[in-house]
């Protein structure tokens, strides 16, 4: 199980994975204690017939081909998560691990 | 967390989840003992901004809109093994768990 | 960019009164508990006081329970600390927090004779 | 009322050297909100780790944090000229904000 890694000078049209980086204060995020920014990534690129599919289900379904379905598309098929500080909505100060907030590895399905 | 389930009637144009019976012979999947057919069910539809969304990284990216992101697409976010006993390359017959073969439920991610 | 800024510091002779302000910007003021902490020169941080989102609700450290009133005017975005019966241990740089994360850059209160 | 001890008071290292700061709980407390500060003269408290030990963003990773309990620990690698300060550790339970006497770390 693989994904490609790309950056801003890539020329890759595939499905690659991307750096991103999140900066809260910048959204108006400000019930974000910490931390105020983080490395986040992000899917992005084409997905050609078997490239980089996650499932034998996506291929099943391309053979199947029924109504309506689009085909792969270029999204995480592995997420890790993050340690975060913040407000809850009752003024309560929460810390806690927020699941599937940094891409790790990017794939078609 | 949940998902929407539509069938062939149905005129719901927003991300949802269809069912589908993958069918081995008709594939020509003849490594395949049993099932010989199955329910998989694909994912289909549209993903207007938040509907769905699985995770929060697929909202903060989509603020942050980097270059090339394409925004979310629907897909499998729930997905359970089956059964299948198989001839496997060296004509050794093999009954195990595959995972992801069926999708239970359909996001946008 | 999130901004606290002091006001109200100076020179007042033991007994008196001064009132210190903070003005936020940048921040949904309404949504959050605020505090004040303070620092006497040369000395650690000490929390005085803090209080809720709402106004509703106020706490106080022991050493200036019943002295000091903190409140707030959400529709100013301001938190307000109402000082009273100052004693030279009072003497500190005081700032406006919401804690843990931001920070003004303080005000000082000298209490002299 | 919680009561946090730090020691030393001050820590006279040279540029390089590994620093370790301690922070001892008169009570257990929770490590989620256990927090350490740098103050430099002049200037306000910046948030430096999170929760014992997470780094706050734009915070090198040449600092650390760890510990549970009563016993607390912040740690420089090597110390870079930038680092020399006032290090403060806080602990937080509903309203009320506990903060540690401060240890300097001062140029030797």
């Known amino acids: 199980d693989f994904g490609l890694d790309c950056d801003e000078h890539s020329t890759e049209s595939r499905c690659c994975r991307y750096p991103l980086t999140v900066d809260f204060e910048a959204f108006g995020w400000d019930w974000i204690i910490a931390p105020k920014r983080y490395k986040a990534n992000y899917c992005s690129g084409e997905c050609e017939f078997v490239f980089l599919q996650k499932y034998p289900h996506t291929h099943l379904v391309h053979q199947a081909n029924p109504r309506g379905s689009a085909g792969p598309c270029c999204t995480p098929t592995k997420m890790s998560p993050i340690n975060m500080l913040y407000f809850n909505g009752k003024e309560q100060i929460i810390y806690g691990k927020i699941p599937a907030m940094v891409v790790d590895r990017c794939g078609c399905s | 967390d949940f998902g929407l389930d539509c069938d062939e009637h149905s005129t719901e144009s927003r991300c949802c989840r269809y069912p589908l019976t993958v069918d081995f012979e008709a594939f020509g999947w003849d490594w395949i003992i049993a099932p010989k057919r199955y329910k998989a069910n694909y994912c289909s539809g549209e993903c207007e901004f938040v509907f769905l969304q699985k995770y929060p990284h697929t909202h903060l990216v989509h603020q942050a809109n980097p270059r090339g992101s394409a925004g979310p697409c629907c897909t499998p976010t729930k997905m359970s093994p089956i059964n299948m006993l198989y001839f496997n390359g060296k004509e050794q017959i093999i009954y195990g768990k595959i995972p992801a073969m069926v999708v239970d439920r359909c996001g946008c991610s | 960019e999130v901004q606290l800024l002091e006001s109200g510091g100076g020179l007042v002779q033991p007994g008196g009164s001064l009132r210190l302000s903070c003005a936020a910007s940048g921040l949904t003021f309404s949504r959050y508990g605020m505090s004040w902490v303070r620092q006497a020169p040369g000395k650690g941080l000490e929390w005085v006081s803090a209080i809720n989102s709402s106004g509703g609700s106020t706490y106080y450290s022991d050493t200036v329970k019943g002295r000091f009133t903190i409140s707030r005017d959400n529709s100013k975005n301001t938190l307000y600390l109402q000082m009273n019966s100052l004693r030279a241990e009072d003497t500190a740089v005081y700032y406006c927090?919401?804690?843990?994360?931001?920070w003004g850059q303080g005000t000082l209160v000298t209490v002299s004779s | 009322e919680i009561v946090l001890t730090q020691s030393p008071g001050t820590l006279s290292l040279s540029p390089g050297e590994r620093a370790t700061l301690s922070c001892r709980a008169s009570?257990?407390?929770?490590?989620?909100?256990l927090h350490w500060y740098q103050q430099k003269p002049g200037q306000a408290p910046r948030l430096l780790i999170y929760?014992?030990?997470n780094l706050a963003a734009g915070i090198p990773d040449r600092f650390s944090g760890s510990g549970s309990g009563t016993d607390f620990t912040l740690t420089i690698s090597r110390l870079e000229p930038e680092d020399f300060a006032v290090y403060y550790c806080q602990h937080y339970s509903g309203y009320h904000f506990t903060f540690g006497g401060g240890t300097k770390v001062e140029i030797k």
């Open positions: 929760s014992t030990s």
């Open positions: 927090a919401r804690l843990p994360d931001y």
């Open positions: 009570q257990s407390v929770s490590s989620s909100y």
